[in-house]
């Protein structure tokens, strides 16, 4: 057989036995001559051992470049490949010789004691036990122990080859401590040497770099990268690093095994790469590869090297953030910088501190945004090394879906006297202001809330046939006034009013307000009654501790049995937008009240008096009257609101001012409180008395000093007092210039 590529001028060495395989018996002489065209050498099995004393290589007597190999009394162990080759080339001729020794069918190893086979238990992996044969066609099985198992060739993955040995799937013998080959010749068993089985791991579970990402340094700093490989047991690991600047003077690599807990099914290996002073050329990808021979796993990270410390805002930094009330707002501070900057947030110039509602860090998070969060937020980045600062302003606009103020104030069951003109109001607060407020209506009987009809929170009305107020056929004549804008409780609100010219039919009215972030609606139950009429004496809205009388007046010829009730707490709360059950049909929720009856020529008047009204007296009061003929009950409901007592407060400050003689001074002092406070003015702690030059108007709210004189200079005090106390503000008026002489002088 020929091995190697023939050169242009050289022929292959020629053997005297022109066969690939030669079979001879033991104890005979093996002699092969090799001829060629230049210096030749022989290689034979075991020729690295001491057996060459038996092997004789001689020069041929009949020519140059010829050598004869002779082995007298060959034994089984001489089985193998015999190669004749030209020195310093790959050109060779090979013959495989079987020395049939039936007493020793397996070729013994060099040590003749035992061999070692290394196996890995990965998928589709076979192992070769090198029990070579001196006979080519033996029936060989493999014995493994302990426990004892015998494996015979199955024609595929289990096989024996005299030149190679016994091949078997690794997993089949991984349990064994030792294996050997066995051949049967004429009922006689022959065994190879023993092979110790060593299971070698190969699995690498993972390779982790630390730090794993976002590594940034500036020139001159030290880089330390740790690469940890986790493997199964019985594994050895080789680490290999790839990095941008391979010819680094200050590079240091340290590899070591890490201790793992006893009983752990895992090993850990660590490789540490250190570069003492990085340069710009050290920027780039760093890759750590861990190899176990059968498996390689790698991991990479990018190292960024900056010329010097710096800080800047990233291009994605927002300048305007829009949100709706109740949302979570996140404003990230997007920056470029090394090292990471210190981040400080300010709102309208005031530093923000984190609490349960706001988190001020890399990201400014407002958990549930409210209107008061609207404003300008400034983020200041400070580089911790260079102290360089960068600032950026973010405007936060908080939108509010339409909220209708009266929703929470007005009872949904007020009654209105037949034929009267009534005004219904929706006061809408929204940011941005509503782009429209529309009114709708429908007849009360079309939407009667019968208990049999299913009403849910998602569909509060059994009828949804709302009609536009432009189409008032069959209903009350309506006029919608142009929207008004008013500053109420310090907020710009939109007021939409609907005027019912004559209250003729009971209906439901709905106002719907819409802006860019939502909608709000209010349903008003407009119940028209021809029955009793309720009035309040002396005031529509009494204050706590004041007395109030509720008068129920009914035509004596039509009605009888006038009774006052108070609507008690609902056993089931009315859901938003749900229609209440008509009170006359459900007297269970009413509390009967004591009242006094008076009469005049045409009417009965039932008066219910509340002395020292309290906040608990607020609620819906029902006057019930019975039709004398039909005995049908008529109810009128009036909501009573009791105003809370509030101590006086003065809104706005009096400003110190300087005025020239002869000019005028006008100042105002607006006070609020309940009961409304009395306003008094003082000059230098003396009560200010009106005269021709000093004018007090609007319940003393406005003070005017005409043609000021030098003696008008001084400390002016506005004091607002009620039974609940006083509030005051002060200002100093300076009068400049020389006093003009008057004519009288």
């Amino acid at each position: 057989a020929s091995v190697g590529l023939p050169s242009v001028s050289l022929d292959l060495p020629r053997l005297s036995i022109q066969k690939d395989i030669l079979t001879i018996k033991a104890n005979t002489t093996l002699q092969i001559t090799c001829r060629g065209q230049r210096d030749l050498d022989w290689l034979w099995p075991n020729n690295q051992s001491g057996s060459e004393q038996r092997v004789e290589v001689t020069e041929c007597s009949d020519g140059l470049f010829c050598k004869t190999l002779t082995i007298p009394k060959v034994i089984g162990n001489d089985t193998g490949a015999y190669k004749c080759f030209y020195r310093e080339t790959d050109l060779a001729s090979v013959i495989y010789v079987y020395v049939q020794d039936y007493r020793s069918p397996f070729i013994a190893s060099v040590s003749d004691q035992h061999g070692v086979v290394y196996i890995t238990e990965n998928k589709n992996k076979t192992v070769v036990i090198p029990c070579l044969g001196s006979i080519s066609n033996l029936n060989v099985s493999l014995c493994a122990r302990y426990p004892e198992k015998r494996f015979v060739p199955d024609g595929n993955r289990i096989s024996w080859d005299s030149k190679k040995g016994f091949t078997i799937p690794s997993y089949m013998i991984s349990y064994a401590g030792m294996v050997f080959c066995e051949a049967k010749i004429n009922d006689e068993s022959y065994q190879s040497i023993m092979y110790i089985v060593v299971v070698v791991g190969y699995r690498i579970y993972d390779v982790v770099l630390s730090p794993s990402h976002g590594i940034e340094l500036s020139v001159g700093e030290k880089l330390v990268l740790n690469c940890t490989a986790r493997t199964e047991l019985n594994v050895g690991i080789d680490f290999n690093w790839e990095y941008p600047s391979s010819k680094h003077q200050h590079k240091k690599l340290v590899n070591r095994d890490l201790k793992t807990q006893s009983g752990s099914e895992m090993k850990k290996f660590l490789s540490t790469l250190t570069i003492d002073g990085v340069t710009r050329s050290d920027q780039g990808l760093y890759t750590c590869a861990a190899s176990s021979g059968l498996m390689t796993k790698k991991n990479s990270t990018f190292v960024r090297v900056h010329e010097k410390p710096f800080v800047a805002f990233g291009s994605g930094m927002e300048s305007l953030v829009e949100a709706t009330v109740g949302e979570r707002v996140r404003i990230p501070a997007k920056y470029l910088g090394y090292p990471p900057p210190e981040i400080k947030w300010y709102k309208n110039g005031i530093p923000l501190e984190s609490n349960h509602t706001i988190k001020a860090g890399h990201v400014l998070t407002i958990m549930e945004v409210s209107e008061r969060d609207t404003g300008n937020y400034t983020v200041i980045l400070t580089n911790p090394i260079s102290k360089e600062k960068q600032s950026h302003v973010v405007s936060l606009v908080v939108y509010v879906p339409p909220q209708i103020g009266e929703k929470s104030l007005i009872s949904p069951v007020d009654s209105y006297q037949y034929g009267t003109t009534q005004t219904l109001t929706c006061t809408v607060y929204a940011i941005p202001p509503p782009h429209h407020i529309h009114w709708y209506w429908q007849l009360e009987e079309e939407c009667a809330n019968e208990p049999s009809q299913a009403v849910s929170v998602t569909n509060p009305y059994p009828c949804e046939e709302w009609r536009s107020v432009e189409d008032f056929q069959g209903g009350n004549k309506i006029e919608v006034n142009k929207n008004q804008f008013a500053l109420i409780e310090g907020k710009n609100k939109t007021v939409s009013t609907l005027v019912i010219q004559a209250a003729n039919v009971s209906a439901l009215y709905k106002c719907e307000a819409v802006n860019k972030v939502g909608r709000g609606e209010r349903v008003i139950s407009f119940h028209v009654t021809r029955g009793p009429e309720i009035t309040l004496q002396p005031d529509m809205q009494p204050t706590e501790q004041e007395s109030v009388s509720l008068w129920c007046t009914a035509d004596r010829s039509t009605f009888e049995n006038l009774t006052w009730y108070k609507l008690g707490p609902q056993p089931l709360p009315i859901h938003v937008g749900e229609l209440p059950t008509p009170v006359c049909k459900n007297l269970d929720t009413l509390w009967k009240l004591n009242a006094t009856m008076f009469s005049n020529s045409t009417n009965d008047i039932l008066i219910m008096e509340l002395k020292n009204a309290s906040l608990q007296d607020q609620g819906d009061y029902v006057c019930l009257a019975q039709d004398r003929k039909t005995k049908k009950r008529h109810c009128v409901v009036r909501q009573l609101t009791v105003l809370e007592r509030v101590a006086p407060t003065i809104t706005g400050n009096l400003e110190n001012q300087t005025t020239s003689i002869g000019e005028s001074i006008e100042v105002s002092c607006t006070a609020s409180g309940n009961p409304p406070p009395q306003i008094m003015w003082f000059k230098d702690n003396e009560t200010l008395v009106e005269d021709s030059g000093i004018v007090l108007k609007d319940g003393n709210r406005n003070l005017t000093i005409r043609r000021v004189r030098k003696e008008d200079e001084g400390l002016y005090t506005c004091q607002a007092c009620s039974v609940l106390g006083c509030a005051k503000v002060e200002a100093f008026f300076i009068i400049e210039g020389a006093q003009e002489k008057t004519n009288l002088e």
């Epitope: 589709n124 992996k125 199955d154 997993y171 089949m172």
Partner: antibody
Framework: SVEESGGRLVTPGTPLTLTCTVS????????MSWVRQAPGKGLEWIGI?????NTCYANWAKGRFTISKTSTTVDLKITSPTTEDTATYFC?????????????WGPGTLVTVSS | AVLTQTPSPVSAAVGGTVTIKCQSS????????LSWYQQKPGQPPKLLIY???TLASGVPDRFSGSGSGTQFTLTISGVQCDDAATYYC???????????FGGGTEVVVK
């Protein structure tokens, strides 16, 4: 050698167990797989039981079949047969570490599922 | 995994060459865990090739296999009448549960 048995006509939903009996094969060294073939259709690998008794099923077969073994037999239980399970079921010898190689097959046993 | 065999059926004259392709939806384990089987009517399948290209014992050397990863080929050169059968490829994967046969290719010998 390998031989399957237990194939018969069953009604849908009635559990059925097929048995594969081996001789001259050491089940503590070899893995055994079950493969089926619907009439006029191709082969479908069902699952394998390893020499150590671990089982693995084709993704489509999980929950529908159970494989178990003794020292000389390997069972395939069809938990709740449907008409789609009508097929010839083969038992084949393979290797723990090489699921996609079967070098000894049984002749097969026919299962018919019909109401 | 899905193994797609093409073409089917395939027709060949005695002495001709037949090539059957098998494409896998994902790479087989070790790029070579693919075997080929021959099945004749009424008989169980018979192993022809494993490890994509290793001839099973007792199989004539006119059968050969090639390919790696996702594309594999079974070639029958010098087709004989006895080669008329259906041929299946079988792939093994990282996850044993993905093991699957191809749909089969019927070889008709004229």
């Amino acid at each position: 050698s390998v031989e399957e048995s237990g194939g018969r006509l069953v009604t849908p939903g009635t559990p059925l167990t097929l048995t594969c009996t081996v001789s001259g094969i050491d089940l503590s060294s070899y893995a055994m797989s079950w493969v089926r073939q619907a009439p006029g259709k191709g082969l479908e690998w069902i699952g394998i039981i390893s020499s150590t008794g671990n089982t693995c099923y084709a993704n489509w077969a999980k929950g529908r079949f159970t494989i178990s073994k003794t020292s000389t037999t390997v069972d395939l239980k069809i938990t709740s047969p449907t008409t789609e399970d009508t097929a010839t079921y083969f038992c084949a010898r393979g290797y723990d570490d090489y699921v996609a190689l079967f070098n000894m097959w049984g002749p097969g046993t026919l299962v018919t599922v019909s109401s | 995994a899905v193994l797609t065999q093409t073409p089917s059926p395939v027709s060949a004259a005695v002495g001709g060459t037949v090539t059957i392709k098998c494409q896998s939806s994902q790479s087989v384990y070790n790029n070579n865990a693919l075997s080929w089987y021959q099945q004749k009517p009424g008989q169980p399948p018979k192993l022809l090739i494993y490890d994509a290209s290793t001839l099973a014992s007792g199989v004539p050397d006119r059968f050969s296999g090639s390919g790696s990863g996702t594309q594999f080929t079974l070639t029958i050169s010098g087709v004989q009448c006895d080669d008329a059968a259906t041929y299946y490829c079988l792939g093994g994967y990282d996850d044993d549960a993905d093991t699957a046969f191809g749909g089969g290719t019927e070889v008709v010998v004229k």
